[in-house]
Amino acid sequence: DFGLDCDEHSTESRCCRYPLTVDFEAFGWDWIIAPKRYKANYCSGECEFVFLQKYPHTHLVHQANPRGSAGPCCTPTKMSPINMLYFNGKEQIIYGKIPAMVVDRCGCS
Amino acid sequence: DFGLDCDEHSTESRCCRYPLTVDFEAFGWDWIIAPKRYKANYCSGECEFVFLQKYPHTHLVHQANPRGSAGPCCTPTKMSPINMLYFNGKEQIIYGKIPAMVVDRCGCS
């Protein structure tokens, strides 16, 4: 299981993971106490047939070619959590692990 | 965590799980001993902003709006395995659980 890593200078057109820092402060999301920003990453690029396909299922759907199936798209295939300190709706401070906040790998599914 | 279920008569344009039977026999995949066919399902439809987003990350990338991020696409968000009996490359019969062969839920990521 692997995925491509790119940056803003890359000429790669295929499905790739790009760096992205999410800045909660810039969004005005002040209910988030910490972190104020974190490295989230994102997926972008083309999914040619079979390239970086995560599941055998993706290949099978392509073979079966049902009505309306758009073909695979470049999407997170491995994600990880981050710890966050934030206010909930009741204005209580919560410290917890928020799942799927960081893209570790991108693939076609 | 939920997803929409549709069928061939549905008028739903949003991201939805559709029934699909994969027929290995029809593909000519005769190294698969059993099952000869199985219900695989597939995902199709539009991902309007926030609809059926699996991860908070998807929302954050939309907020940050980096170059080349295409927006979320309709993709499996929950999958399950099936047991299969098949010949491997060494012509040995293998019985095993093959992961991610059935789409249980679709979402936008």
Partner: antibody, heavy 124, light 107 residues
């Protein structure tokens, strides 16, 4: 750059109230806890309480809870500390300080910026 | 409340000396200890956080150590500008509490 500028010195009579201001600049005021600390002449530092400007949630040292009120004005990025029923032993320099998180744990922070201090003298 | 006992309360030293100030908490504070420097008529300045991490811009002659209840601040080679009062602060539990201070004077 990040700066906290406090109001000028005050002289008050016993039993009166004082309201000290702390104007923030150079950062997003609503997203950082503001703390208040005081120091009596020739004495050590004493924590009064803190407030989160985004929602006004505050936390007080029990010693001050009955007499101190922390507030903010988001429109002017200003924090206030009001102390009522003043006594002579409230004579002190009052400081505001910003709490900066270096990590995500509830105690993963330190004071990165302080106001210059406001001397409050309580005398009859 | 957690009591913070700082020692010594005053200390005379010469330029170039290495000095150590200690802070003892009345219970385990999980390394949530900061050190401050304060000069007369000025606001305190943060030096060390989380017991041993140096605040950006603070010279490396300042160092912190310790865990549990016992913590130390060390200044490796005193310069004239280092003569000031030093305070510790525990941030493990509310209310936050400071040590009573150590006045570092020129010998």
């Amino acid at each position: 750059q990040v700066q906290l500028v406090q109001s000028g010195a005050e002289v008050k009579k016993p039993g009166a109230s004082v309201k000290v201001s702390c104007k923030a600049s150079g950062y997003s005021f609503t997203g950082y806890f503001m703390h208040w600390v005081r120091q009596a002449p020739g004495q050590g530092l004493e924590w009064i309480g803190n407030i989160y400007p985004y929602n006004g949630v505050s936390n007080y040292n029990q010693r001050f809870k009955a007499r101190a009120t922390l507030t903010v004005d988001k429109s002017t990025s200003t924090a206030y500390m009001e102390l009522r029923s003043l006594r002579s032993d409230d004579t002190a320099v009052y400081y505001c300080a910003r709490r900066y998180y270096y990590g995500t744990g509830p105690a993963d922070w330190y004071y990165d910026v302080w106001g210059q201090g406001t001397l409050v003298t309580v005398s009859s | 409340d957690i009591q913070m006992t700082q020692s010594p309360s005053s200390l005379s030293a010469s330029v170039g000396d290495r000095v150590t100030i200690t802070c003892k908490a009345s219970q385990d504070i999980n390394s949530y200890l900061s050190w401050f420097q304060q000069k007369p008529g000025k606001a305190p300045k943060s030096l060390i956080y989380r017991a041993n991490r140096l605040v950006d811009g603070v010279p490396s002659k300042f160092s912190g150590s310790g865990s549990g209840q016992d913590y130390t601040l060390t200044i490796s080679s005193l310069q004239p500008e280092d003569f000031a009062t030093y305070y510790c602060l525990q941030s493990d539990e509310f209310p936050l509490t400071f040590g009573q201070g150590t006045k570092l004077e020129i010998k």
